[in-house]
């Protein structure tokens, strides 16, 4: 969450027993009652809020899907971190899924790159060192990758 | 009687300033969030600005630096001070009682900023 | 900021008609949506607050639905009053997000 156009810069130390609102907000952890007054918590493992706010609610904890693992899990103050499982990767324009990583190397390039769960093998032209990007090759041109990345 | 009446407005030049009324009766502000909205003529609402209860305010992007919101509790009334005005403020500004959850219940009946040379 | 998108920007209709207009809000602000009716002259009046809850002295043919990121409004028998404008604004998150209103609905006379 972005807090924007906020005014009072000082915020007070976040305290364990907070009930009322400082300077109009609430701190990480809680959000604002519908009258304004008081500062209700979050409820662990459902929802956070990481800012501070005036949001009248929690935001919803992020569920890991299937072909994800949870590298955190949600807290009243940060959401759940979920990361591809390996031998998949989570491109930058395509945030909503996990793809199975390229096995190998179009022939005639080499892998300099290995699968991460950001990013797929980066595969460069031996002569030029030229990067390739792109969909994966067809098998019979497919250069096998090392024993140590997985397999789609 | 609820109500909230504006005052204040009128003609100003470019790079002037004026500062906006708005008197209370009927309740105490001092219990409530308060906020400012602006209406260009043949336009749409705009929200200028809000203070808290606890008289933090805060400001649309465009609002900062040049508008503040403050509040007399003691005299009910709220204000809006506007520095370096331009041909775009030119507006009818609203005041109303900001209730949270429950949204903008009560409104002014506006004053009008015309900024012109 | 949120930003809310509403549509249509016009619409033009019959006395009696069924009328829905349209919010979207940029991301989730659960049930906090108040919907406002104005005239020409006049500030705007309060119709709708909590996505579908009727403020106080308003006509049971206005009625509200939605909740996340996507509303309604509907008016199921449009009355010759209701010629006017009609916005959206969020309530939650005000000073975290602002309150940036939608940018009407103007319901004219066919």
């Known amino acids: 969450i972005t807090q924007q156009d906020l005014a009072p810069q000082q915020r007070a130390a976040p305290q364990q027993k907070r009930s009322s609102p400082s300077e109009g907000l609430c701190p990480p952890g809680h959000h604002i009652s519908e009258d304004g007054r008081d500062c209700i918590s979050c409820k662990y493992g459902q929802d956070y809020s990481t800012h501070w706010n005036d949001l009248l609610f929690c935001l919803r904890c992020t569920r890991c899907d299937s072909g994800e693992v949870e590298l955190s899990p949600c807290t009243t103050t940060r959401n759940t971190v979920c990361q591809c499982e390996e031998g998949t990767f989570r491109e930058e324009d395509s945030p909503e899924m996990c793809r199975k990583c390229r096995t190998g190397c179009p022939r005639g390039m080499v892998k300099v790159g290995d699968c991460t769960p950001w990013s797929d093998i980066e595969c460069v032209h031996k002569e030029s060192g030229t990067k390739h990007s792109g969909e994966a090759p067809a098998v019979e041109e497919t250069v096998t990758s090392s024993p140590g990345t997985p397999a789609s | 009687q609820v109500q909230l009446v504006e005052s204040g407005g009128g003609l100003v030049q470019p790079g002037g300033s004026l500062r906006l009324s708005c008197s209370a009766s009927?309740?105490?502000?001092?219990?409530?969030?308060m906020i400012w909205v602006r209406q260009a003529p043949g336009k749409g609402l705009e929200y200028v600005g809000f203070?808290?209860?606890?008289?933090?305010?805060y400001y649309a992007s465009w609002a900062k630096g040049r508008f503040t919101i403050s509040r007399d509790n003691s005299k009910n009334t709220l204000y809006l001070q506007m520095n370096s005005l331009r041909a775009e403020d030119t507006a009818v500004y609203y005041c109303?009682?900001?209730?949270?959850?429950?949204?903008?219940?009560?409104w002014g009946q506006g004053t009008l900023v015309t900024v012109s040379s | 900021d949120i930003q809310m998108t509403q549509s249509p920007s016009s619409l033009s209709a019959s006395v009696g008609d069924r009328v829905t207009i349209t919010c979207r809000a940029s991301q989730s602000i659960s049930t906090y949506l108040s919907w406002y009716q104005q005239k020409p002259g006049q500030p705007p009046k309060r119709l709708i607050y909590k996505a579908s809850t009727l403020a106080s002295g308003v006509p049971s043919r206005f009625s509200g639905s939605g909740s996340g990121t996507d509303f309604t409004l509907t008016i199921s028998s449009l009355q010759p009053e209701d010629f006017a404008t009609y916005y959206c604004?969020?309530?939650?998150?005000?000073?975290?997000?602002?309150?940036?209103f939608g940018g009407g609905t103007k319901v004219e006379i066919k």
């Open positions: 203070i808290t209860s606890d008289s933090s305010a």
């Open positions: 009927g309740f105490s502000i001092s219990r409530y969030a």
């Open positions: 109303a009682r900001y209730t949270y959850s429950d949204g903008t219940d009560l």
């Open positions: 604004q969020p309530n939650s998150g005000i000073a975290t997000y602002g309150a940036a």
